[in-house]
Structures are given as C-alpha cells and as structure tokens.
Amino acid sequence: PEPPTACREKQYLINSQCCSLCQPGQKLVSDCTEFTETECLPCGESEFLDTWNRETHCHQHKYCDPNLGLRVQQKGTSETDTICTCEEGWHCTSEACESCVLHRSCSPGFGVKQIATGVSDTICEPCPVGFFSNVSSAFEKCHPWTSCETKDLVVQQAGTNKTDVVCGPQDRLRA
C-alpha cells in the first residue's frame, strides 16, 4: 500500500509511518516501527508534559522563588505545570506571575486613579486633555497644564498627556 502522507489525530508521521503520540504526562522513548508500538515513559517527579506529544524530554515544573515573593498556588502534576502566586499583599507582574511587586506604577501619560491596597494593585488612568504626567508613579495623579493666561503669558508650546505647556511672553508688537 501507498505510505501515508498524513496521520490521524494523536498520531505523527515518521519514516513513512503513522505512530501514536505519547499521552500527556509521558515522554517519547522510541518511535514505533512496523512491528512495535511507540514507547513512552512517565515524566519524573518535578516534570510535566501537558499535550499529546513526541517530546524526548519533559518540561521542568516552574519554581516559585520565595526570593521573588512567589509561593505555590497549585502544585504541578505530570500533566500540568506548577502555578505560582504572590505572597499576601504583593501583586503579580504578569499573567504568568513570574515575579511580584508591592504595587505597580503608572507610566508617564497616566495618573493614579486609586492607590494600591493590601488586596488591590494601583489603578491607573490616562491623563485627559488638559492634564499630564511626566513621571512613573504609584501615587501621583495627572497634573493640570499650567495656565499661561493667569501668568499674563501665552502658550509657546502645547501640552501633551506627558508634558506641560510651555509659556512665554506675549508678543508686544502690534501691526
């Protein structure tokens, strides 16, 4: 018969032959042959594979480093990775929770809407027109642009969400 060019789900093509993939939690030891099935072995104690696979090495479970403020939220199995979370009062820096911060800062162009607490992180908001923030801060709100008019000056450079307006003297020359 004609050798296959594609295989069924949970199979892979090798040496013109369809072999079974290893199930989650197991790694590939040897490909199948005309006469033998795919050989798989369970992952070790601190390892996992979470898909049907042909991997020859299992992945190491994530380490929740206490020096980064991390602790184990859910212990890994042979089929799942360990899930880390932060110590109480700390907040993950990303969805993957690779490190923790006491709170996040709002970038330039954003102001603090709500200062962090033990349970909630800093809430930032974009500076609206007429306001700016030129710093990274965990407590500063957006500042209003300087009013040149009240200083008897004129706007020489428009403000942005990250910069204040630049005021200058009025042009005394009249046509």
């Epitope: 403020g69 820096t93 911060v101 006491l102 800062s105 965990a138 407590f139």
Partner: nanobody
Framework: EVQLLESGGGLVQPGGSLRLSCAAS???????EMWWFRQAPGKGLERVS?????????YYADSVKGRFTISRDNSKNTLYLQMNSLRAEDTAVYYC?????????WGQGTLVTVSS
C-alpha cells in the same frame, strides 16, 4: 546592585518622636519615587508615605496624616520619615522601597516600638 538600609528605629513612649532614615545606593536616587511601608506584628504591609524623585509631591496614609513627614536629601541619597505624636498602633517594622516595588527593591526594615 540596589541597596536600601533603614535606621533610626527604637523604643519610644506614646506621644514621642523618631526620625527614620533610608540610605540608598546602586541606583540614581534622585530619579526615583520612594515609599515607606510598615508591617505591624501579625498584620499585612501598610503603605505609609511616598515622595516623588524631586521631593515636590508627597503622599500620606490617612492614619499618619499630620503626624508623619516624609522628605529626601538627593545629595546624600537618603530618604527620611519624621514621626511625631507616636501611638501604640504605629508599632511596626518600617521599610523603604523604590520603583519598581519588587522583592529586591526594598530594605530589611527598622523596628519601631511605641510603648510606655
């Protein structure tokens, strides 16, 4: 390597005063907002006060407003917290921290005990 070293803690009677210092090294001090946190025995971390890099903007928790004053001397790379009218509930380990507020960007703390 960022280093933050707090000092100035101690035992003080209610109504007394203390001045905490935080000596900073390993980064451009003037370019960073700084915070004071505290942790009372068996409690979570509490945000006490913050100051902008220039020193022009400050923040105080309601519990310390009017009693504590945060300041900084950028020429000495040092952050301060002047604590007046101390109360028993101010007893805690006080920490300084810099942005980003990660585990390696805060100090070891100094213990303040307010007791008669």
């Amino acid at each position: 390597e960022v280093q933050l070293l707090e000092s100035g803690g101690g035992l003080v009677q209610p109504g007394g005063s203390l001045r905490l210092s935080c000596a900073a090294s390993g980064f451009t001090f003037a370019g960073y907002e700084m915070w004071w946190f505290r942790q009372a025995p068996g409690k979570g971390l509490e945000r006490v006060s913050a100051i902008s890099g220039s020193g022009g903007s400050t923040y105080y928790a309601d519990s310390v407003k009017g009693r504590f004053t945060i300041s900084r001397d950028n020429s000495k790379n040092t952050l301060y917290l002047q604590m007046n009218s101390l109360r028993a509930e101010d007893t805690a380990v006080y920490y300084c921290a810099k942005d980003p507020y990660s585990f390696d960007n805060w100090g070891q703390g100094t213990l303040v005990t307010v007791s008669s």
